[in-house]
């Protein structure tokens, strides 16, 4: 009998609100034995695959997808899926990447926490998160959003 594959998780380092031109790394995690991790954009037809899978812990494997210099076009929802022979897993929750415009270099204002989407979490979109602190001084026009529906 085939095992039930656990849902992957997705996180972003150093976070999900990234200054224009700075780097970000998406980290996909799943069980050991994963052959391929896939990082998907909102459309399932836009994705990156990697077989560069490492063991994050005795029970977890991971793959890392780095963007060296984020642009407005990188903003939007991302999710992970993996292939553990002989089948593909379910998708992780969405993780929303926000790109913040900077005034004079890749460094600027501040917003809420929440930079990972685990197997049981909502996407990290804290406009829906009653526990997240209010944004301190970051105006909407400073962020590049990609609106989507879950």
């Amino acid at each position: 009998q085939e095992e039930d594959l656990p849902r992957p998780s997705i996180s972003a380092e150093p976070g999900t609100v990234i200054p224009l031109g700075s780097h970000v790394t998406f980290v996909c995690r799943g069980p050991v034995g994963v052959q391929t991790f896939r990082l998907e954009r909102e459309s399932r037809s836009t994705y990156n695959d990697t077989e560069d899978v490492s063991q994050a812990s005795p029970s977890e494997s991971e793959a890392r997808f780095r963007i060296d210099s984020v642009s407005e076009g990188n903003a939007g929802p991302y999710r992970c899926i993996y292939y553990k022979p002989p089948k593909w897993s379910e998708q992780s929750d969405y993780l929303e990447l926000l790109v913040k415009e900077t005034s004079g270099g890749p460094d600027s204002p501040d917003t809420e926490p929440g930079s990972s989407a685990g197997p049981t979490q909502r996407p990290s979109d804290n406009s829906h998160n009653e526990h997240a602190p209010a944004s301190q001084g970051l105006k909407a026009e400073h962020l590049y959003h990609h609106h989507h529906h879950h």
Partner: antibody, heavy 118, light 108 residues
Framework: EQSVEESGGGLVAPGGSLTLTCTVS????????MGWVRQAPGKGLEWIGY?????TTFYASWAKGRFTISKTSTTVDLKMTRLTTGDTATYFC??????????????WGPGTLVTISS | ELVLTQTPASVEAAVGGTVTINCQAS??????LAWYQQKPGQPPKLLIY???DLASGVPSRFKGSRSGTEFTFTISDLECADAATYYC??????????FGGGTEVEIK
């Protein structure tokens, strides 16, 4: 009022083990990554590791194997094993997530002192 | 492994004066650098993040800047309350977290 407080420090003999507990109030651990940082007497800050909202843990290279971070709904534990005199320090628990960065800390506990001595 | 080299180890300045502290990263960390203030017997307090942005409630006397992998922290119009040890920290990723060695600021 949001707060973080460490407990469990004290005197331990070399080779022993100790578990420190960080108790949080006023916010949910399901929304914040929590880190541990230590400071030897008269020395600088040293990052130990942290735990993601959904439980994945990360450690400094020197801490892997001897230090383990875990959490419940309201506490974050740091289990330390095979302790040596070099582990004598004040241990701080800190909340990450400021400006949406995982390990940017803006809420710290007062610290708890751990002394390793025979 | 990422290393942050902070200089000087200590500095003395007069009330009303200016202090400058440097932090050199051993590899590129974009602008992912923060500065903390720590007074004796207290935990650190976040002052600056993203190299130059002030954390909430921090006065504009504190200033940060970046040039490549070199970061500079300046306190102007020094007050007695600024006597403390200051640390830089990178939050570049979960695997390269590091603090600088610290700079003790004395006010004369």
């Amino acid at each position: 009022e949001q707060s973080v407080e460490e407990s469990g420090g004290g005197l331990v003999a070399p080779g022993g083990s100790l578990t420190l507990t960080c108790t949080v109030s006023g916010f949910s651990l399901s929304n914040y990554h929590m880190g541990w940082v230590r400071q030897a007497p008269g020395k600088g800050l040293e990052w130990i590791g942290y735990i993601y909202t959904h439980g994945t843990t990360f450690y400094a290279s020197w801490a892997k194997g001897r230090f383990t971070i875990s959490k419940t709904s309201t506490t974050v534990d740091l289990k330390m094993t095979r302790l040596t005199t070099g582990d004598t320090a004040t241990y701080f628990c800190a909340r990450g997530g400021y400006a949406d960065y995982n390990i940017l800390y803006n809420l710290w506990g007062p610290g708890t002192l751990v002394t390793i001595s025979s | 492994e990422l290393v942050l080299t902070q200089t000087p180890a200590s500095v003395e300045a007069a009330v009303g004066g200016t202090v400058t502290i440097n932090c050199q990263a051993s590899q590129s960390i974009s602008s992912y650098l923060a500065w903390y203030q720590q007074k004796p017997g207290q935990p650190p307090k976040l002052l600056i993040y993203d190299a130059s942005d002030l954390a909430s409630g921090v006065p504009s006397r504190f200033k940060g800047s970046r040039s490549g992998t070199e970061f500079t922290f300046t306190i102007s119009d020094l007050e007695c309350a600024d006597a403390a040890t200051y640390y830089c920290q990178t939050y570049d990723s979960s695997t390269t977290a590091a603090f600088g060695g610290g700079t003790e600021v004395e006010i004369k």
